[in-house]
């Protein structure tokens, strides 16, 4: 906590300049007027304040704007952004992509994933939806940041924007996010030819349902194993050995390498060993011949 003292007359601050680097914490607290600081925020980033001094300046802004900073201040936070917590950022209303760009640049090289995620969330809320300009900004200045958004926020992406998303932007997306993005991508790329469609839809396939994966198996797409491994477990389990063989084409041999990993392991357990043997890969763990499979979940549903 910063102790309160009165400002010595010779230390009175009339503008934000580099002379302030010589002020002790209590002098900054006593002598810097919060309104002056807010009005001259654009000067702060040029001054090498210590993190300790930045804490004092942040404290002054917090007192002036307890409900959250206005965008005119946020835009010029510069390295003071490094002092913000996700709780601070949640109070902001940000609509300008220039503000977003400025703060994304500041955060580069610092461990600020939670703050950046919250900032992006505030921008999406402020702008009303995740529009093309916002997606373009994220892909340019913060690859992978798209996946920091919640499925609820991602649901505001219009299908027309999906084309701006690059494969690397989806690398850190989880299943729930891909569940939201996949139907949009399917809609966005629906008029493309088979091979072109597959190239475009591939990064989103972690959200594809079984019927769509089955449909792809009929199109000679030769899905690579990395993409197959990212498919939803629920989408892979109902596939037959023949469908998986068609889906992977020459990449089917990779199943042996991934034999112990989900979803391959779980899929193997659901196949008849006879069928697995037809692949000639030595996959083990299928259902032995002569065994009857009872789907108890169906029986429970009927009772």
């Amino acid at each position: 906590d910063v102790e309160r003292t009165t400002c010595p007359p010779e230390k009175e601050v009339h503008e934000i300049d580099e002379s302030l680097i010589f002020y002790k914490k209590r002098e900054l607290e006593a002598c810097v007027d919060a309104a002056l600081l807010a009005a001259q925020m654009d000067r702060v980033d040029a001054i090498p304040f210590t993190y300790e001094q930045l804490d004092v300046l942040k404290h002054k802004l917090d007192e002036l704007y307890p409900q959250g900073y206005p965008e005119s201040v946020i835009r010029h936070l510069g390295h003071l952004f490094l002092k913000m917590s996700p709780e601070d950022i949640r109070k902001w209303n940000v609509t300008s992509l220039e503000t977003l760009k400025a703060l994304l640049k500041v955060s580069k090289g610092h461990e600020m994933s939670a703050q950046v995620a919250t900032l992006i969330d505030r921008v999406v809320v402020g702008r009303g939806q995740l529009d093309k300009d916002t997606v373009d900004t994220l892909t340019a200045f913060c690859p992978g940041c798209l996946c920091s958004l919640s499925p609820e926020r991602l649901s505001s992406v219009p299908p027309s924007v999906i084309g701006a998303v690059r494969p690397q932007d989806l690398d850190t997306c989880g299943p729930r996010q891909l569940d939201v993005l996949y139907p949009k991508a399917r809609l966005a790329f629906q008029n493309m030819s088979g091979s072109e469609y597959f190239v475009k839809i591939r990064p989103f396939l972690g959200g594809a349902p079984t019927e769509d994966v089955k449909a792809l198996s009929q199109q000679n797409v030769s899905m690579d194993l990395a993409t197959f491994m990212k498919l939803r477990r629920e989408a892979v389990l109902p596939l037959t050995v023949a469908e998986v063989q068609k889906l992977l084409g020459p990449h089917v041999e990779g199943l042996k390498v991934e034999e112990q990993h989900s979803p391959v392991r779980d899929w193997i357990l659901k196949q008849r060993q006879d069928d697995l043997d037809t692949l000639g890969l030595g996959l083990q763990g299928g259902i032995p011949n002569g065994y009857l499979i009872l789907d108890l979940s169906v029986r429970e549903a009927l009772s």
Epitope: E18, D45, A46, I47, P48, F49, T50, Y51, G78, H79, K105, V106, G109, H110
Partner: nanobody
Framework: EVQVVESGGGLVQPGGSLRLSCAAS????????GGWFRQAPGEQRELVAS???????KYADPVKGRFTISTDTAKNTVDLQMNSLGPEDTAVYYC???????????????WGQGTQVTVSS
């Protein structure tokens, strides 16, 4: 990994001189920002002298004309020559380095462990 190490502190009589040196590894002072802070017992830390290509050389009022900050680019050090020392200069002196970002503004900061300067007869 960035390291900032001070040397040269000690006991000196009033009116005497001392030279503090700060050596950095993992960061160059050239083009960045180097400074000396001090903290007297029961007081808050204060900047004594600093230098950077962006802001030039700056001194706190109490040390103007007595202290001189300089850099040795070849050795990557920031030195503080302290003359006419008085008991009020007794403090732990800290070296400070701050990265100047190519886009403007300042990045990470680095502090030394501090070196004790005692002025007493």
């Amino acid at each position: 990994e960035v390291q900032v190490v001070e040397s040269g502190g000690g006991l000196v009589q009033p009116g005497g001189s001392l030279r503090l040196s700060c050596a950095a590894s993992g960061i160059t002072f050239s083009g960045n920002y180097g400074g000396w802070f001090r903290q007297a017992p029961g007081e808050q830390r204060e900047l004594v002298a600093s230098m950077s290509s962006a802001l030039g050389t700056k001194y706190a009022d109490p040390v103007k004309g007595r202290f001189t900050i300089s850099t040795d680019t070849a050795k990557n050090t920031v030195d503080l020559q302290m003359n006419s020392l008085g008991p009020e200069d007794t403090a732990v002196y800290y070296c400070y380095a701050r990265v100047r970002l190519s886009r403007g503004g300042w990045g990470s900061e680095y502090w030394g462990q501090g070196t004790q300067v005692t002025v007493s007869s």
